[in-house]
């Protein structure tokens, strides 16, 4: 069964997925897709990495952690009710049928009506539209658009909270952290 994660409309959703690479430059390809993991690959791919690079991502999906160390946790920016459902994190270990597949269920809750937004959690305004790239080279040698402006203090605070959260620990405990090499 899928591990369940929750996010509110307008917030950023966090879907953890981890592995341990043999070395920071010798990575395992990973794909994220909308929908349960199929037999091969990912369906409806929203983000993909290869042995070295993040070579495909779209405007609302990006990696929060250091993917060179195997933190391929997905952030979905500014979620809507349409974002609910199953997401597949597939760690594409070389060899026949060696892939590690994790299905994560995202449940979207309606936004709470509050007198004022909580600043620490509500930082989606800090993100302009992210470019879509398919491995076009160094970031500012591209002409596809701007990369996301991220408030690092807020991100770091959120990352620390998530790192300590029971959900992240539950995922690790359920086997979503694997060692490669």
């Amino acid at each position: 069964s899928e591990v369940e994660y929750r996010a509110e409309v307008g917030q950023n959703a966090y879907l953890p997925c981890f592995y341990t690479p043999a070395a920071p430059g010798n990575l395992v390809p990973v794909c994220w897709g909308k929908g349960a993991c199929p037999v091969f690959e990912c369906g409806n791919v929203v983000l993909r990495t290869d042995e070295r690079d993040v070579n495909y991502w779209t405007s609302r999906y990006w990696l929060n952690g250091d993917f060179r160390k195997g933190d391929v946790s997905l952030i979905i920016k500014n979620v809507t009710l349409d974002d609910h459902g199953i997401y597949c994190c597939r760690i594409q270990i070389p060899g026949i049928m060696n892939d590690e597949k994790f299905n994560l269920k995202l449940v979207i809750k309606p936004a709470k009506v509050t007198p004022a937004p909580t600043r620490q959690r509500d930082f989606t305004a800090a993100f302009p539209r992210m470019l879509t790239t398919r491995g076009h080279g160094p970031a500012e040698t591209q002409t596809l658009g701007s990369l996301p402006d991220i408030n690092l203090t807020q991100i770091s605070t959120l990352a620390n909270e998530l790192r300590d959260s029971r959900l992240a620990n539950d995922l690790r405990d359920s086997g979503a952290t694997i060692r490669i090499g």
């Epitope: 430059g25 990369l147 990352a159």
Partner: antibody
Framework: QVQLQESGPGLVKPSETLSLTCTVS??????????WNWIRQPPGKGLEWIGY???????NYNPSLKSRVTISLDTSKNQFSLKLSSVTAADTAVYYC?????????????WGQGTLVTVSS | EIVLTQSPATLSLSPGERATLSCRAS??????LAWYQQKPGQAPRLLIY???NRATGIPARFSGSGSGTDFTLTISSLEPEDFAVYYC?????????FGQGTKLEIK
């Protein structure tokens, strides 16, 4: 346009700790996907990658220097820093800070001007 | 780690001539090779990434080729500002490594 600028003492005594700071201006320090690196170049020699820090604070170091290197981040000042302990004359070099992005890992598209650090008593 | 060997160590040419610089890897780096230009007192500048792709703002006279273990940086017609030291760098295997450089000097 992003700019990187190194600063720190130009002279360090043997066995002491070398400390340098890189200040990033032009906006990209607050963008996800960027890695902030230190690279050095001994006089008349080639370049050597020292290590990186990611915005989350995650670090990674060259195995040849790992036991002596610490890279840290100060997001409030748009700075990241290098500390290299127990230095010897072999650590005399021009030290550069540089940036790469996860869409083209380890391809360093922006560099600081470099700062010469001499290890001598 | 992968060792990159650049040749020649020094290349003496005149403006307008064609320059060919070589970089050889101790093992295959596929196409994961970059070239940088460094002038005295300045930081390295990215010219070519992934063997053959010019970085932003790099003139068309600079081109890169090769794959596997043998790579070439070609400057089709040398301009006075091209005389500098050129480094290759691989990103195929960790840690990333650089060559020792080729000095391109005016004859």
């Amino acid at each position: 346009q992003v700019q990187l600028q190194e600063s720190g003492p130009g002279l360090v005594k043997p066995s002491e700790t070398l400390s340098l700071t890189c200040t990033v201006s032009g906006g990209s320090f607050s963008r996800g996907g960027y890695y902030w690196n230190w690279i050095r170049q001994p006089p008349g020699k080639g370049l050597e990658w020292i290590g990186y820090i990611y915005y989350s604070g995650s670090t990674n170091y060259n195995p040849s220097l790992k036991s002596r290197v610490t890279i840290s981040l100060d997001t409030s000042k748009n700075q990241f820093s290098l500390k290299l302990s127990s230095v010897t004359a072999a650590d005399t070099a021009v030290y550069y800070c540089a940036r790469d992005h996860y869409s083209s890992s380890w391809t360093f598209d922006y560099w600081g001007q470099g700062t010469l650090v001499t290890v001598s008593s | 780690e992968i060792v990159l060997t650049q040749s020649p160590a020094t290349l003496s040419l005149s403006p307008g001539e064609r320059a060919t610089l070589s970089c050889r890897a101790s093992q295959s780096v596929s196409s994961y090779l970059a070239w940088y230009q460094q002038k005295p007192g300045q930081a390295p500048r990215l010219l070519i990434y992934d063997a053959s792709n010019r970085a932003t703002g790099i003139p068309a006279r600079f081109s890169g080729s090769g794959s596997g273990t043998d790579f070439t940086l070609t400057i089709s017609s040398l301009e006075p500002e091209d005389f500098a030291v050129y480094y290759c760098q691989q990103r195929s295997n960790w840690p990333p490594t650089f060559g020792q450089g080729t000095k391109l000097e005016i004859k």
